[in-house]
Amino acid sequence: KESCDVQLYIKRQSEHSILAGDPFELECPVKYCANRPHVTWCKLNGTTCVKLEDRQTSWKEEKNISFFILHFEPVLPNDNGSYRCSANFQSNLIESHSTTLYVTDVKSASERPSKDEMASRPWLLYR
């Protein structure tokens, strides 16, 4: 029998390589049984995670899982960094793994690095 605890399925050590100026949706996969929990996004600043209060978010429902989406319209260079989603469920706070956005600023990048380059050589993003 599957657990009815809320689960947040952001992949551990996950990364997204994205371009400034593009739209982007950051998904937090949420598994729950009955009542949909209250979910929020925050951005890591050192050891603290700063809640993103005024950002556009939405829900997307699929057959066995739902997604709480943080919208970037468009992506800005200072969106670079690590994000986490968290859910309040039966007075418990459940936190996801963090996921990292590597933002390439197209104005400063002479050419667009490949996904593999960006994954293996993140310093390319800060040229």
């Epitope: 689960q7 399925y9 952001i10 992949k11 551990r12 050590q13 996950s14 990364e15 997204h16 390589s17 996969p29 066995n64 899982i65 793994h97 996904k115 593999d116 994954a119 293996s120």
Partner: antibody, heavy 119, light 112 residues
Framework: QVQLVQSGAEVKKPGASVKLSCKAS????????AHWVRQAPGQGLEWIGR????????KYDPKFQGRATMTADTASNTAYLELSSLRSEDTAVYYC????????????WGQGTLVTVSS | DIVMTQTPLSLSVTPGQPASISCKSS???????????LNWFQQRPGQSPRRLIY???KLDSGVPDRFSGSGSGTDFTLKISRVEAEDVGVYYC?????????FGQGTKLEIK
């Protein structure tokens, strides 16, 4: 239940390339990582790397960086490993491995594909 | 890279007797999320590896409770309380805290 079905055995000459496939079923392919691990005859296990099928993001052991290429096709729920400039030391069984919702815990293993590199 | 060192590299055990395998990592495997990504795998002759234990001590479903895992930081142990004939094979520890992920060199378990 989770199933990972890998392509059949390959025999290649030194310097050639090989592309292995791993078809996943029984879970949402996009919500997990696909890893590749190899094992030379009579030797131990060696992690090659992993791919996030949702966005194509990859991580490789530096030993394989530049010679190994992992890709994933979410339409067919298939992960691929291409290894180029083959040498005899690449003779091994290559396993594809999936984990539960991207936990990176190597939960489910395929049956393996034997690649033999010989002139 | 994190080096995983297993001892012994082989052991021969009488059925019903206990067995213990040690795994030492070159660096603490405690991740920033508070979890320790240390697994144990069993590979029976001619088969794919299968996971026995994850996150140091959590037993996979279907794994007999004679298997147990313990440890923290850099020192980890796999114990079999009473070895059975079906336990023959090679046992590997593995770390998934740091890239690149690495395996121990393996410990071959034989029955006396």
């Amino acid at each position: 239940q989770v199933q990972l079905v890998q392509s059949g055995a390959e025999v290649k000459k030194p310097g050639a390339s090989v592309k292995l496939s791993c078809k996943a079923s029984g879970y949402n392919f996009k919500h997990t990582y696909a890893h590749w691990v190899r094992q030379a005859p009579g030797q131990g296990l060696e992690w090659i790397g992993r791919i996030d099928p949702a966005n194509g993001n990859t991580k490789y052991d530096p030993k394989f960086q530049g010679r190994a290429t992992m890709t994933a096709d979410t339409a067919s729920n298939t992960a691929y490993l291409e290894l180029s400039s083959l040498r005899s030391e690449d003779t091994a069984v290559y396993y594809c491995v999936a984990d539960h919702y991207g936990s990176s815990l190597l939960d489910y293993w395929g049956q393996g594909t034997l690649v033999t590199v010989s002139s | 890279d994190i080096v995983m060192t297993q001892t012994p590299l082989s052991l021969s055990v009488t059925p019903g007797q206990p067995a213990s395998i040690s795994c030492k990592s070159s660096q603490s495997l405690l991740d920033s999320d508070g979890k320790t990504y240390l697994n144990w795998f069993q590979q029976r002759p001619g088969q794919s590896p299968r996971r026995l234990i994850y996150l140091v001590s959590k037993l996979d479903s279907g794994v007999p409770d004679r298997f147990s895992g313990s440890g923290s930081g850099t020192d980890f142990t796999l114990k079999i309380s009473r070895v059975e004939a079906e336990d023959v094979g090679v046992y590997y520890c593995w770390q998934g805290t740091y890239f690149p992920y690495t395996f121990g060199q393996g410990t071959k378990l034989e029955i006396k």
